[in-house]
């Protein structure tokens, strides 16, 4: 927890941020909460970014104040105005790009005092993998595909029956650059699979971890996938 210090006789208030990750080409949220005030007009929220001269966003007297906003954030930022009164200073960022990564500061002034906390914001690309049986292959083969990742992830196969087995010798992973020349399509093929087994394709980089599971029996195929963001640390 980072606690802001008091200035000019004012007390310090607690401001809490959570390190988070943004998926490029989506809207992102930079989380920040603070000790609420009873009067909206007494609350000032300033978002700043290390290395950026202008403000990322400013909210004061119950409304946005964007005259000092840096050009790189023009038209892209918003606070949740109806939630400021309950201590939510989180920032919405439109169309996240790689260049949005960095250290942000959430700075709060209320009638109770001042406080701030830093937030480490990572940007990249992550997507859900889909695992399918590759019927075109000569032997029983699984194909795991995920459309967008950045930075380049690692891909690891696992199976329920052969727990702890190393499938690197019987799998092949390729990365194909997408048309926007940043993100990549991930394709991993697993050979010599056996029936009545559950296989997992795990894709991971320093931002996210995603898993695609497939259970193949003689009568049916069951699929499941999930994704989790990494490094969500409160400060």
């Amino acid at each position: 927890l980072i606690i802001g210090f008091g200035i000019s006789g004012r007390h310090s208030i607690t401001v809490t941020t959570v390190a988070s990750a943004g998926n490029i080409g989506e809207d992102g949220i930079l989380s920040c909460t603070f000790e609420p005030d009873i009067k909206l007009s007494d609350i000032v929220i300033q978002w700043l970014k290390e290395g950026v001269l202008g403000l990322v966003h400013e909210f004061k007297e119950g409304k946005d104040e964007l005259s000092e906003q840096d050009e790189m954030f023009r038209g892209r930022t918003a606070v949740f105005a109806d939630q400021v009164i309950v201590g939510n200073a989180s920032l919405r960022l439109k169309n996240v790009q790689l260049t949005d990564a960095g250290t942000y500061k959430c700075y709060i002034i209320t009638s109770k005092g001042k406080g701030n906390a830093n937030l480490e914001y990572k940007t990249g690309a992550f997507s859900m993998p889909e695992v399918n049986v590759d019927y075109n292959a000569s032997s029983e083969t699984l194909r795991c595909e995920a459309p967008r990742w950045f930075p380049q992830p690692t891909v690891v196969w696992a199976s329920q029956v052969d727990q702890g087995a190393n499938f690197s010798e019987v799998s092949n992973t390729s990365f194909e650059l997408n048309s926007e020349n940043v993100t990549m399509k991930v394709v991993s093929v697993l050979y010599n699979v056996t029936i009545n087994n559950t296989y997992s394709c795990m894709i991971e980089n320093d931002i996210a971890k995603a898993t695609g599971d497939i259970k193949v029996t003689e009568s049916e195929i069951k699929r499941r996938s999930h994704l989790q963001l990494l490094n969500s640390k409160a400060s």
């Epitope: 989506e26 946005d64 964007l66 023009r74 439109k94 690309a125």
Partner: antibody, heavy 116, light 109 residues
């Protein structure tokens, strides 16, 4: 030059299907939020659908389950597949790029008429 | 659902006069996500103002935007003949993701 050119409109019977295309030049479609916006005769603008840079999609309630937005990154082209068309879908359909600064690039529009 | 209500529905003015168009939201809208468009008959809309007050590229400085929260205004300081058109405000970020106002028709008196 940054430009969007729509095509694929026409006269279609209720219940029919149509696919609109929007060819982009001068910028990369997959780096932007790309939208379809329509305008019924004599009416105002109505947002229809968006495809985010990530490929995720969103729709207005009036077209959800009937319309599908997609893009072909290799062709730098946006599409709108319209199924189960109704008379109230009759409109000029525009594709528009939502850059960071609002919908700053629009196509010329393509007319869809749904009538028996 | 955010509803944008524009007023007046029609505004009749003469060239050289000042035009003030209003856009009121049913709930708070971020200034960053509020835009204004101009549309002439048979043409596609054109972006005028983004972020409530920033002029888009190539837009003359007689056009200005202001406001925050639920009340936004588009002002044309001195009307030129080519300014007579329909004007729409638009918000981003709520459900539905984009919403347009119903439009204000600016006509020659």
């Amino acid at each position: 030059e940054v430009q969007l050119v729509e095509s694929g409109g026409g006269l279609i019977q209720p219940g029919g299907s149509l696919r609109l295309s929007c060819a982009a030049s001068g910028f990369i479609v997959s780096r932007n939020y790309m939208n379809w916006v329509r305008q019924a005769p004599g009416k105002g603008l109505e947002w229809v659908s968006v495809i985010y840079g990530s490929g995720r999609t969103d729709y207005a309630d009036s077209v959800k389950g009937r319309f599908t937005i997609s893009r072909d990154n290799s062709k730098n082209t946006l599409y709108l597949q319209m199924n189960s068309l109704r008379a109230e879908d009759t409109a000029v359909y525009y594709c528009a790029r939502d850059g960071d600064y609002g919908m700053d690039v629009w196509g010329q529009g393509t007319t869809v008429t749904v009538s028996s | 659902e955010i509803v944008l209500t524009q007023s007046p529905g029609t505004l009749s003015l003469s060239p050289g006069e000042r035009a003030t168009l209003s856009c009121r939201a049913s709930q708070s809208v971020s200034s960053s996500y509020l835009a204004w468009y101009q549309q002439k008959p048979g043409q596609a809309p054109r972006l005028l103002i983004y972020g409530a007050s920033s002029r888009a590229t190539g837009i003359p400085d007689r056009f200005s935007g202001s406001g925050s929260g639920t009340d936004f205004t588009l002002t044309i300081s001195r009307l030129e003949p080519e300014d007579f058109a329909v004007y729409y405000c638009q918000q981003y970020g709520s459900s539905p993701l984009y919403t347009f106002g119903q439009g204000t028709k600016l006509e020659i008196k």
